[in-house]
Protein backbone atom coordinates (compact mmCIF):
# COMPACT_ATOMS: atom_id res chain seq x y z
CA UNK A 1 0.00 0.00 0.00
CA UNK A 2 1.15 3.54 -0.71
CA UNK A 3 1.37 6.44 1.69
CA UNK A 4 -0.17 9.79 0.91
CA UNK A 5 -0.71 13.15 2.53
CA UNK A 6 -4.34 13.61 3.42
CA UNK A 7 -5.94 16.80 2.18
CA UNK A 8 -6.00 19.13 5.16
CA UNK A 9 -8.53 21.67 3.95
CA UNK A 10 -11.92 20.00 3.75
CA UNK A 11 -13.71 16.70 4.13
CA UNK A 12 -16.97 15.06 3.20
CA UNK A 13 -18.76 12.37 5.17
CA UNK A 14 -18.02 8.96 3.69
CA UNK A 15 -21.32 7.34 4.63
CA UNK A 16 -23.90 10.09 4.21
CA UNK A 17 -24.70 9.48 0.54
CA UNK A 18 -24.75 11.82 -2.43
CA UNK A 19 -28.20 13.28 -1.92
CA UNK A 20 -27.34 14.12 1.68
CA UNK A 21 -23.77 15.30 1.19
CA UNK A 22 -24.73 17.10 -2.03
CA UNK A 23 -21.15 16.77 -3.24
CA UNK A 24 -20.05 19.44 -0.77
CA UNK A 25 -16.80 19.17 1.13
CA UNK A 26 -17.47 20.63 4.54
CA UNK A 27 -14.68 22.63 6.10
CA UNK A 28 -14.61 20.50 9.21
CA UNK A 29 -12.04 18.31 10.86
CA UNK A 30 -11.60 14.66 9.97
CA UNK A 31 -14.00 12.40 11.87
CA UNK A 32 -11.61 11.54 14.65
CA UNK A 33 -10.02 14.22 16.77
CA UNK A 34 -6.90 13.19 18.62
CA UNK A 35 -7.38 12.76 22.34
CA UNK A 36 -4.65 15.35 22.81
CA UNK A 37 -7.24 17.88 21.68
CA UNK A 38 -9.90 19.24 24.09
CA UNK A 39 -10.29 17.42 27.38
CA UNK A 40 -14.00 18.01 27.85
CA UNK A 41 -16.33 15.95 25.62
CA UNK A 42 -18.66 18.93 25.45
CA UNK A 43 -16.05 20.95 23.62
CA UNK A 44 -16.25 18.49 20.74
CA UNK A 45 -19.74 19.69 19.99
CA UNK A 46 -18.29 22.66 18.11
CA UNK A 47 -17.44 20.29 15.28
CA UNK A 48 -20.67 20.54 13.34
Amino acid sequence: MEDFNMESDSFEDFWKGEDLSNYSYSSTLPPFLLDAAPCEPESLEINK
Partner: antibody, heavy 120, light 116 residues
Framework: QVQLVQSGAEVKKPGSSVKVSCKAS????????ISWVRQAPGQGPEWMGW????????NYAQKFQGRVTMTRDTSISTAYMELSRLRPDDTAVYYC?????????????WGQGTLVTVSS | QAVLTQPSSLSASPGASVSLTCTLR?????????IYWYQQKPGSPPQFLLR?????????GSGVPSRFSGSRDASANAGILLISGLRSEDEADYYC?????????FGGGTQLTVLG
Protein backbone atom coordinates in the same frame (compact mmCIF):
# COMPACT_ATOMS: atom_id res chain seq x y z
CA GLN B 1 -3.80 5.90 14.17
CA VAL B 2 -7.43 5.75 15.23
CA GLN B 3 -9.01 2.30 15.39
CA LEU B 4 -12.59 1.23 15.89
CA VAL B 5 -12.64 -1.52 18.51
CA GLN B 6 -15.80 -3.59 18.90
CA SER B 7 -17.16 -5.70 21.73
CA GLY B 8 -16.77 -9.45 21.77
CA ALA B 9 -18.81 -12.26 20.25
CA GLU B 10 -22.31 -12.92 21.53
CA VAL B 11 -24.62 -15.94 21.55
CA LYS B 12 -28.29 -15.04 21.86
CA LYS B 13 -31.64 -16.79 21.98
CA PRO B 14 -34.33 -16.05 19.41
CA GLY B 15 -36.54 -13.20 20.55
CA SER B 16 -33.85 -11.58 22.68
CA SER B 17 -31.76 -8.47 21.99
CA VAL B 18 -28.08 -7.80 21.46
CA LYS B 19 -26.12 -4.59 21.97
CA VAL B 20 -22.78 -4.21 20.20
CA SER B 21 -20.32 -1.45 21.06
CA CYS B 22 -17.78 0.35 18.89
CA LYS B 23 -15.09 2.42 20.59
CA ALA B 24 -12.73 4.87 18.92
CA SER B 25 -9.36 3.82 20.31
CA UNK B 26 -6.68 6.49 20.09
CA UNK B 27 -9.17 9.13 19.10
CA UNK B 28 -12.55 10.65 19.77
CA UNK B 29 -15.80 10.17 17.87
CA UNK B 30 -16.57 13.34 15.97
CA UNK B 31 -19.24 14.59 13.60
CA UNK B 32 -19.06 12.02 10.80
CA UNK B 33 -21.48 9.13 10.57
CA ILE B 34 -20.80 5.76 12.13
CA SER B 35 -22.42 3.12 9.94
CA TRP B 36 -23.33 -0.36 11.01
CA VAL B 37 -22.96 -3.10 8.41
CA ARG B 38 -23.63 -6.78 8.93
CA GLN B 39 -22.50 -9.79 6.98
CA ALA B 40 -24.15 -13.19 7.26
CA PRO B 41 -21.96 -16.26 6.64
CA GLY B 42 -21.10 -16.53 2.95
CA GLN B 43 -23.11 -13.42 2.09
CA GLY B 44 -22.31 -9.88 1.03
CA PRO B 45 -22.39 -6.90 3.38
CA GLU B 46 -25.75 -5.41 4.37
CA TRP B 47 -26.06 -1.83 5.58
CA MET B 48 -28.19 -1.35 8.68
CA GLY B 49 -28.01 2.39 9.21
CA TRP B 50 -25.87 5.15 10.60
CA UNK B 51 -25.65 7.53 13.52
CA UNK B 52 -24.13 10.98 13.64
CA UNK B 53 -22.08 10.86 16.85
CA UNK B 54 -22.19 14.62 17.20
CA UNK B 55 -25.94 15.14 16.98
CA UNK B 56 -27.17 11.63 17.75
CA UNK B 57 -29.24 11.74 14.57
CA UNK B 58 -29.88 8.38 12.95
CA ASN B 59 -30.83 6.96 9.56
CA TYR B 60 -31.93 3.34 9.61
CA ALA B 61 -32.33 1.02 6.64
CA GLN B 62 -36.00 0.32 6.06
CA LYS B 63 -35.51 -3.39 6.67
CA PHE B 64 -34.41 -2.74 10.26
CA GLN B 65 -36.79 0.07 11.16
CA GLY B 66 -38.42 -0.65 14.51
CA ARG B 67 -35.90 -3.34 15.43
CA VAL B 68 -32.60 -1.46 15.53
CA THR B 69 -31.49 1.36 17.80
CA MET B 70 -28.21 3.21 17.34
CA THR B 71 -26.87 5.39 20.13
CA ARG B 72 -23.59 6.90 21.22
CA ASP B 73 -21.80 8.08 24.35
CA THR B 74 -19.40 10.84 23.35
CA SER B 75 -17.85 10.93 26.81
CA ILE B 76 -16.32 7.49 26.22
CA SER B 77 -16.01 7.74 22.42
CA THR B 78 -18.33 4.80 21.89
CA ALA B 79 -21.19 4.05 19.52
CA TYR B 80 -23.75 1.28 20.10
CA MET B 81 -26.06 -0.78 17.94
CA GLU B 82 -28.90 -2.70 19.56
CA LEU B 83 -30.94 -5.19 17.56
CA SER B 84 -34.10 -6.61 19.13
CA ARG B 85 -36.42 -9.53 18.44
CA LEU B 86 -33.53 -11.57 17.18
CA ARG B 87 -34.08 -14.38 14.70
CA PRO B 88 -31.72 -17.14 13.57
CA ASP B 89 -31.19 -15.31 10.27
CA ASP B 90 -29.71 -12.38 12.24
CA THR B 91 -26.65 -14.56 12.78
CA ALA B 92 -23.86 -12.49 11.23
CA VAL B 93 -20.71 -10.51 11.82
CA TYR B 94 -21.65 -6.93 12.71
CA TYR B 95 -19.24 -4.13 11.79
CA CYS B 96 -19.09 -0.46 12.61
CA UNK B 97 -17.44 1.83 10.09
CA UNK B 98 -16.74 5.49 9.54
CA UNK B 99 -14.78 7.63 7.16
CA UNK B 100 -14.33 10.83 5.25
CA UNK B 101 -13.34 11.93 1.78
CA UNK B 102 -11.18 14.75 0.51
CA UNK B 103 -11.12 15.84 -3.08
CA UNK B 104 -8.86 13.02 -4.23
CA UNK B 105 -8.80 10.47 -1.40
CA UNK B 106 -11.15 8.74 0.99
CA UNK B 107 -10.22 7.26 4.34
CA UNK B 108 -12.43 4.51 5.71
CA UNK B 109 -12.25 2.99 9.20
CA TRP B 110 -13.81 -0.35 10.12
CA GLY B 111 -14.09 -2.20 13.37
CA GLN B 112 -12.83 -5.76 13.57
CA GLY B 113 -16.36 -7.15 13.62
CA THR B 114 -18.54 -8.79 16.26
CA LEU B 115 -19.98 -12.23 15.61
CA VAL B 116 -23.56 -12.53 16.84
CA THR B 117 -24.98 -16.04 16.81
CA VAL B 118 -28.71 -16.49 17.28
CA SER B 119 -29.60 -20.02 18.22
CA SER B 120 -32.05 -21.80 20.47
CA GLN C 1 -33.96 -8.26 -10.00
CA ALA C 2 -31.12 -7.20 -7.71
CA VAL C 3 -30.09 -3.55 -7.69
CA LEU C 4 -26.43 -4.50 -8.22
CA THR C 5 -25.28 -7.67 -9.95
CA GLN C 6 -21.72 -8.99 -9.90
CA PRO C 7 -20.33 -12.17 -11.44
CA SER C 8 -19.88 -14.69 -8.67
CA SER C 9 -16.31 -15.65 -9.55
CA LEU C 10 -13.39 -14.73 -11.74
CA SER C 11 -9.89 -16.12 -12.10
CA ALA C 12 -6.74 -14.72 -13.69
CA SER C 13 -2.99 -15.19 -13.67
CA PRO C 14 -0.45 -13.06 -11.83
CA GLY C 15 0.56 -9.98 -13.82
CA ALA C 16 -2.69 -9.91 -15.77
CA SER C 17 -5.22 -7.11 -15.80
CA VAL C 18 -8.75 -7.95 -14.75
CA SER C 19 -12.02 -6.05 -14.93
CA LEU C 20 -14.68 -6.71 -12.31
CA THR C 21 -18.13 -5.53 -13.28
CA CYS C 22 -21.03 -4.25 -11.25
CA THR C 23 -24.19 -4.04 -13.32
CA LEU C 24 -26.98 -1.74 -12.19
CA ARG C 25 -30.58 -2.82 -12.51
CA UNK C 26 -32.45 -1.60 -15.55
CA UNK C 27 -33.85 1.85 -14.91
CA UNK C 28 -30.98 2.84 -12.62
CA UNK C 29 -28.47 4.82 -14.67
CA UNK C 30 -24.83 4.15 -13.80
CA UNK C 31 -23.95 7.71 -14.80
CA UNK C 32 -25.95 9.07 -11.87
CA UNK C 33 -24.12 7.11 -9.17
CA UNK C 34 -20.81 6.94 -7.45
CA ILE C 35 -19.79 3.28 -7.48
CA TYR C 36 -17.90 2.21 -4.36
CA TRP C 37 -15.56 -0.77 -4.43
CA TYR C 38 -14.40 -2.88 -1.50
CA GLN C 39 -11.96 -5.74 -1.12
CA GLN C 40 -12.51 -8.34 1.58
CA LYS C 41 -10.25 -11.16 2.67
CA PRO C 42 -11.38 -14.03 4.93
CA GLY C 43 -11.72 -13.05 8.56
CA SER C 44 -11.28 -9.34 7.89
CA PRO C 45 -13.68 -6.44 7.39
CA PRO C 46 -14.20 -5.01 3.92
CA GLN C 47 -11.51 -2.54 2.87
CA PHE C 48 -12.53 0.46 0.80
CA LEU C 49 -10.64 0.62 -2.48
CA LEU C 50 -12.09 3.53 -4.43
CA ARG C 51 -15.21 5.23 -5.64
CA UNK C 52 -15.90 6.26 -9.20
CA UNK C 53 -18.55 8.27 -10.95
CA UNK C 54 -16.57 9.98 -13.69
CA UNK C 55 -12.99 10.95 -14.39
CA UNK C 56 -13.71 14.26 -12.68
CA UNK C 57 -15.43 12.66 -9.69
CA UNK C 58 -13.33 9.82 -8.36
CA UNK C 59 -11.49 9.14 -5.11
CA UNK C 60 -8.93 6.52 -4.21
CA GLY C 61 -8.92 4.85 -0.83
CA SER C 62 -6.13 5.95 1.45
CA GLY C 63 -3.09 3.78 0.86
CA VAL C 64 -4.69 1.95 -2.06
CA PRO C 65 -2.24 1.46 -4.95
CA SER C 66 -2.96 3.14 -8.28
CA ARG C 67 -3.14 -0.26 -9.99
CA PHE C 68 -6.70 -0.34 -8.63
CA SER C 69 -8.80 2.01 -10.74
CA GLY C 70 -12.41 2.64 -11.58
CA SER C 71 -14.36 3.27 -14.75
CA ARG C 72 -17.84 2.73 -16.12
CA ASP C 73 -19.41 1.17 -19.17
CA ALA C 74 -22.47 3.22 -20.03
CA SER C 75 -23.60 0.81 -22.73
CA ALA C 76 -23.66 -2.05 -20.22
CA ASN C 77 -24.92 0.21 -17.40
CA ALA C 78 -22.07 -1.06 -15.26
CA GLY C 79 -19.32 0.16 -13.01
CA ILE C 80 -15.91 -1.41 -13.48
CA LEU C 81 -13.04 -2.09 -11.11
CA LEU C 82 -9.81 -2.57 -13.02
CA ILE C 83 -6.92 -4.31 -11.31
CA SER C 84 -3.67 -4.19 -13.26
CA GLY C 85 -0.51 -6.17 -12.54
CA LEU C 86 -2.47 -8.78 -10.61
CA ARG C 87 -0.73 -10.13 -7.52
CA SER C 88 -1.37 -13.17 -5.37
CA GLU C 89 -2.44 -10.93 -2.49
CA ASP C 90 -5.27 -9.59 -4.65
CA GLU C 91 -7.10 -12.89 -4.19
CA ALA C 92 -10.21 -11.83 -2.28
CA ASP C 93 -13.89 -11.05 -2.55
CA TYR C 94 -14.78 -7.74 -4.20
CA TYR C 95 -18.01 -5.87 -3.54
CA CYS C 96 -19.53 -2.85 -5.19
CA UNK C 97 -21.97 -0.52 -3.47
CA UNK C 98 -24.07 2.53 -4.23
CA UNK C 99 -26.23 4.97 -2.28
CA UNK C 100 -29.68 4.32 -3.71
CA UNK C 101 -33.10 5.36 -2.42
CA UNK C 102 -31.61 6.64 0.83
CA UNK C 103 -29.80 3.42 1.64
CA UNK C 104 -26.47 1.77 0.95
CA UNK C 105 -26.88 -1.20 -1.36
CA PHE C 106 -24.13 -3.79 -1.86
CA GLY C 107 -23.63 -6.20 -4.71
CA GLY C 108 -23.39 -9.92 -4.09
CA GLY C 109 -19.64 -9.90 -4.61
CA THR C 110 -17.09 -11.45 -6.96
CA GLN C 111 -14.61 -14.01 -5.70
CA LEU C 112 -11.32 -13.32 -7.47
CA THR C 113 -8.88 -16.22 -7.69
CA VAL C 114 -5.26 -15.61 -8.67
CA LEU C 115 -4.02 -18.71 -10.46
CA GLY C 116 -0.69 -20.35 -9.89
Amino acid sequence: QVQLVQSGAEVKKPGSSVKVSCKASGGTLSSYAISWVRQAPGQGPEWMGWINPNSGGTNYAQKFQGRVTMTRDTSISTAYMELSRLRPDDTAVYYCASGYCGRARCTSFWGQGTLVTVSS
Amino acid sequence: QAVLTQPSSLSASPGASVSLTCTLRSGINVGAYRIYWYQQKPGSPPQFLLRYKSDSDKQQGSGVPSRFSGSRDASANAGILLISGLRSEDEADYYCAIWHSSAWVFGGGTQLTVLG
